[in-house]
């Protein structure tokens, strides 16, 4: 999946299996991504567990687990706040589109998660204090998480090696270098960037991300998934002048 | 193995009041030296983690990227408090302590918002 | 919870071979180190040997240098150790153990070798 | 390889009296980079080690306040404020400075 860090780092990596993407006292979260295609080193998200932590007198420990065509809007025990303590609706669950798109509130850590189900796969996004991402005490116990260090060198797929401003060869070039089996019906260059064009028209990190997604996969649901995690950016991002990613080696415009 | 305290002591110097620091800036690269600095500590019991070897990795790729000379000054990690978790000893009938912003609000001024992102493939 | 649980241990000749697995839950298992440590019969501890997250290095006790190899599959969050040539002082209880430097253990298996 | 030399290999307690173990290296166990890789392990009857003390004073998680560590270079004591009978087993040292990785033979606590 590609992941944009709380440092505002923009990488595509291809984990597979459970890892942390958030690790501190107060919550953890945990994306399991599988590949898109037989033999893919791409992969994309299928499930995210969430635990909120017990918290003083606010909320009881909670979890929040969404699959591949299971997007609850409720707790594993069936609930949609924290509990029975007294600041219980601190801690909400709302459900904006049945099935699609949910967002939870943790009030009392300043936080608000969104997880939507875009086609087979899910897509999480994130507005938390520094402090409460900083705040983590048993280094020992507490693992890597993607959220702040990124993705090890070792999982990343470049993206440069991949996205090309230039069509012909160049498409080709990219077409050619892409990290899946062809897709069952894998987008012509042009095609894909016409597509993306449509729903992303700035040309930034995103938009390259549902380039490389739909000639990865051939699946358009991507091109969603691209333009609902950049509107959950403008949501959720407190510095509007970093909305938009672009890679280091372009200008920015204006 | 503390490798996840130079990861995020490094996150700390990096992350400005307002802002995080620029990229290109000495104090980031003094950032990143401490960073180097932290990780060679954990070296002996962290050196079969994932952990580790990412992070020796990613400050070798960013001193490249930012071209920061491996000799120079390092920089301090600023400290944050934040009430505990789990049940604390001291119970109030006041909800602000079950909203971040006003009980933060008494300490400082607006909290520093950060986001992260996953998406696609 | 970090869960440590160790397998196929049993009784098996001298110069024989065995085989044991330790499966693991409730952490991230290709971000550690793991090690391996066993304990004879009244006996105090001994480190066997560790490897790293990835496979790419590994470390033996001289004891059983060449005679026993540690492995991991990531994908099913299992580490291995392959003990051969076994002889009468590897009896003992076999522990795995979670990180570079251990600090969770299985409740180990047993190993005996014994004509 | 690094030899550790605990003693008392045997430690008879009383009930809420404190207790002590010394852990002795035959080498230095300072790392280069001025780190003490030395851990304190305890092994309850018919259970599995359970790590207490890791880089000679820091109390794992979950560890009560009564344990604590303390030494340097090679000599490393491990003390026990009040003896709980939970606290019944055997006691090891363990370095993790020098491979390989080595442990003390094991100090036995029992309740008097």
């Known amino acids: 999946p590609h992941l944009r860090t709380f440092t505002d780092r923009f990488q595509t990596c291809k984990v597979q299996g459970a890892w942390p993407l958030i690790d501190n006292n107060y919550l953890n979260v945990q994306a399991t991504n599988t590949p898109v295609l037989p033999g893919s080193a791409a992969t994309a998200t299928s499930k995210l567990t969430i635990i909120f932590k017990n918290f003083q007198e606010c909320v009881d420990q909670k979890v929040y687990q969404a699959e591949m065509d299971e997007l609850p809007a409720a707790f594993v025990d069936g609930s949609k706040n924290g509990g029975d303590k007294h600041g219980a609706n601190s801690l909400k669950i709302t459900e904006k589109v049945s099935g699609q798109h949910v967002e939870i509130q943790a009030k009392y850590i300043g936080t608000t998660i969104v997880v939507r189900q875009v086609g087979r796969y899910l897509t999480f996004a994130v507005r938390m204090p520094e402090e409460v991402v900083n705040a983590v005490e048993d280094w020992d116990s507490q693992g890597l998480y993607l959220c702040l260090r990124g993705c090890p060198l070792n999982q990343q797929i470049d993206f440069q090696a991949f996205h090309t401003n230039a069509e012909g060869t160049g498409a080709r070039r990219l077409a050619a270098a892409s990290p899946a089996p062809t897709a069952p019906e894998t987008f012509p260059y042009e095609t894909a960037v016409a597509k993306c064009k449509e729903k992303l028209p700035v040309e930034d990190l995103y938009y390259q991300a549902c380039v490389f997604d739909l000639l990865t996969t051939g699946d358009v649901n991507f091109t969603l998934a691209a333009y609902y995690a950049l509107e959950d950016v403008k949501m959720l991002h407190s510095n509007k002048d970093k909305l938009h990613l672009y890679e280091r080696t372009r200008d920015l415009p204006g | 193995c503390k490798i996840l305290k130079c990861n995020s002591e490094f996150w700390s110097a990096t992350s400005g009041s307002h802002a995080p620091a620029s990229d290109d800036t000495p104090e980031f690269c003094a950032a990143l030296r401490s960073y180097a600095l932290c990780t060679r500590r954990t070296a002996r019991t962290c050196r079969g983690d994932l952990a580790y070897h990412s992070a020796v990795h990613g400050i070798e790729d960013l001193m490249s990227q930012h071209n920061c000379s491996k000799d120079g000054p390092t920089s301090q990690p600023r400290l944050r408090t934040l009430p505990p978790a789990g049940d604390s000893q001291e119970r109030s009938d006041s909800p602000e302590i079950c909203h971040y912003e006003k009980s933060f609000h008494k300490h400082s001024a607006t909290p520093n918002y950060t986001h992260c992102g996953l998406f696609g493939d | 919870e970090v869960q440590l649980v160790e397998s196929g241990g049993g009784l098996v000749q001298p110069g024989g071979s065995l085989r044991l697995s330790c499966a693991a839950s409730?952490?991230?298992?290709?971000?550690?180190?793991m090690n391996w440590i066993r304990q004879a019969p009244g006996k105090g501890l001994e480190w066997i040997g560790m490897i790293y997250y990835d496979s790419s290095e590994k470390h033996y006790a001289d004891s059983v240098k060449g005679r026993f190899t540690i492995s991991r599959d990531n994908s099913k969050n299992t580490l291995y150790l392959q003990m051969n040539s076994l002889r009468a002082e590897d009896t003992a209880v076999y522990y795995c153990a979670k990180g570079t430097t251990p600090d969770y253990w299985g409740q180990g298996t047993m190993v005996t070798v014994s004509s | 390889d690094v030899v550790l030399t605990q003693s008392p290999l045997s430690l008879p307690v009383t009930l809420g009296q404190p207790a002590s173990i010394s852990c002795r290296s035959s080498q230095s166990l300072e790392y280069s980079d001025g780190y003490t890789f030395l851990e304190w392990f305890l092994q309850k009857p018919g259970q599995s080690p359970q790590l207490l003390i890791y880089?000679?004073?820091n109390r794992f998680s979950g560890v009560p306040d009564r344990f604590s560590g303390s030494g340097s270079g090679t000599d490393f004591t491990l003390k026990i404020s009040r003896v709980e009978a939970e606290d019944v087993g055997v006691y090891y040292c363990f370095q993790a400075t020098h491979d390989p990785l080595t442990f003390g033979q094991g100090t036995k606590l029992e309740i008097k």
């Open positions: 409730g952490f991230t298992f290709s971000n550690y180190g």
């Open positions: 880089e000679v004073s």
